[in-house]
């Protein structure tokens, strides 16, 4: 028997089902009595999800995975996996025996959006050229870590004077909070583009500051 | 006729390192699993290693994991087990044994004795 | 210690029927299939009982296996004197990712 899972990660947002791969060729004559089927965390081997003498042993995994039990015969050993969680991410071995055996890894990437950049001044009044100025860029509830990336009006990178935190809420989502100290010119236009590097997903934010009232 | 049958083992000192052998016949070893189970003197079984049908996937037990390595010719129908950083608990007679996981380790070789000792 | 426990002897007169208990957890004797292996004195281990319950070709049918739970058992009925051997139960254990073998019980028939 030869277990065959998908070489690339299976990207899930957070909150959303998904679906790691696994298939076998089921030779001629095949009972599912004779099937041994494991999902386990391939770091740890704690028991996922198990098909084993002749039924489904059901979820050992918070209650959230569930197999394609009318596949099975096919060959079709794949898990689904609902609303996923932050702490879901990591490597999955499926091992399938009957009479002989095989295993593979397939590898579950988590991900969550960032949302729209909001954007603050310090001070946010009062402003003259040649003053500092202290812009905020903040970010909320995505995963992972994002890149953050400073721009002037222009589009030159502002890479000076940046500093970048980002903090883990108690979902594993990060708040990102990224600050531009920078002097002001007569007029300005600061950008703030907050990526997700996995699903490449850019949200921007700007602020643009004149002798009026200030614009975001 | 289903046989199996195991070669070289024999006494070596401890650290030393020696190489098992497993003949098959009588059955299409190339879609069979394997597995090494050893028998210490007055003791039960333990199982050693397990490996599938392509060598794709290996199985061992802690206590010779790191020190033992299992592997197969199918071309020469042949299961092997190198034996390094031998150890007096090693002692054993060491069985190769035909594994199916639905209808169990179903032929059994004749054993062949390991010693560890100076 | 084996993670798989079985008494280490059992006894009985010829005719009487004795039974092996083979006791595992969760991660092996309670959800996967349970073999039982006979090993004469001298001799290389049989199998006996596959898949919990079932017997290869040509092992008599005084042989039989059941499990409850995290609990496997091996009956003999009509014992004969040629039943003493060592018998041992065997489970694949998912936890471990490994073979597990009871520690074996010495069967003499008085």
């Known amino acids: 028997v030869e277990v065959q899972v998908s070489e690339d990660p299976v990207v899930a947002l957070v909150d959303t089902d998904a679906t790691l791969r696994c298939s076998f060729s089921p030779e001629p004559g095949f009972s599912l009595a004779q099937l041994n089927l494991i999902w386990q965390l391939t770091d740890t081997k704690q028991l996922v999800h198990s098909f084993t003498e002749g039924r489904d042993q059901g979820s050992a995994y918070s209650n959230r995975t569930a197999l394609f039990p009318d596949l099975l015969v096919q060959g079709n050993a794949s898990l689904r996996l609902q609303r996923v969680r932050v702490t879901d991410e990591g490597s999955y071995t499926c091992f399938v025996s009957i009479q002989d055996f095989d295993s593979a890894a397939v590898s579950l990437q988590v991900a969550a959006p960032y949302s729209k950049p909001s954007m603050t001044l310090e001070p946010n009044k009062d402003l003259r050229p040649g003053n500092m100025v202290t812009i905020t860029c903040s970010s909320y509830q995505g995963y992972p870590e994002a890149e953050v990336f400073w721009k002037d009006g222009q589009g030159v990178p502002l890479t000076g004077n940046v500093t970048t935190s980002q903090m883990a809420n108690e979902r594993g989502l990060f708040d990102v909070h990224s600050v531009l100290r920078v002097v002001l010119g007569a007029n300005g236009t600061y950008s703030c583009l907050v990526r997700n590097p996995v699903l490449q997903q850019d949200a921007h934010g700007s602020v643009t500051i004149t002798g009026q009232p200030l614009t975001f | 006729e289903v046989q199996l049958l195991e070669s070289g083992g024999g006494l070596v000192q401890p650290g030393g390192s020696l190489r098992l052998s497993c003949a098959a016949s009588?059955?299409?070893?190339?879609?069979?699993?394997m597995n090494w189970v050893r028998q210490a003197p007055g003791k039960g079984l333990e199982w050693v290693s397990a490996?599938?049908?392509?060598?794709?996937?290996?199985y061992y037990a802690d206590s010779v994991k790191g020190r033992f390595t299992v592997s197969r010719d199918n071309s020469k129908n042949t299961l092997y087990l190198q034996m390094n950083s031998l150890r007096a608990e090693d002692t054993a007679v060491y069985y190769c044994?035909?594994?199916?996981?639905?209808?169990?380790?179903?032929?059994w070789g004749e054993g062949t004795t390991v010693t560890v000792s100076s | 210690q084996s993670v798989v426990t079985q008494p280490p002897s059992a006894s009985g007169t010829p005719g009487q029927r004795v039974t092996v208990s083979c006791s595992g957890s969760?991660?092996?004797?309670?959800?996967?299939?349970v073999q039982w292996y006979q090993q004469l004195p001298g001799t290389a281990p049989k199998l006996l009982i596959y898949?919990?319950?079932r017997r290869p070709s040509g092992v008599p049918d005084r042989f039989s296996g059941s499990k409850s739970g995290t609990s496997a058992s091996l009956a003999i009925s009509g014992l004969q004197s040629e039943d003493e051997a060592d018998y041992y139960c065997?489970?694949?254990?998912?936890?471990?990712?490994?073979?597990?073998f009871g520690g074996g019980t010495k069967l003499t028939v008085l």
């Open positions: 009588g059955f299409t070893f190339s879609g069979s699993a």
């Open positions: 490996i599938n049908s392509g060598g794709t996937t290996i």
């Open positions: 969760s991660s092996n004797v309670g959800s996967k299939y």
């Open positions: 898949a919990t319950d």
């Open positions: 044994v035909k594994l199916d996981f639905y209808y169990g380790m179903d032929v």
């Open positions: 065997a489970s694949w254990d998912d936890s471990l990712n490994a073979w597990v």
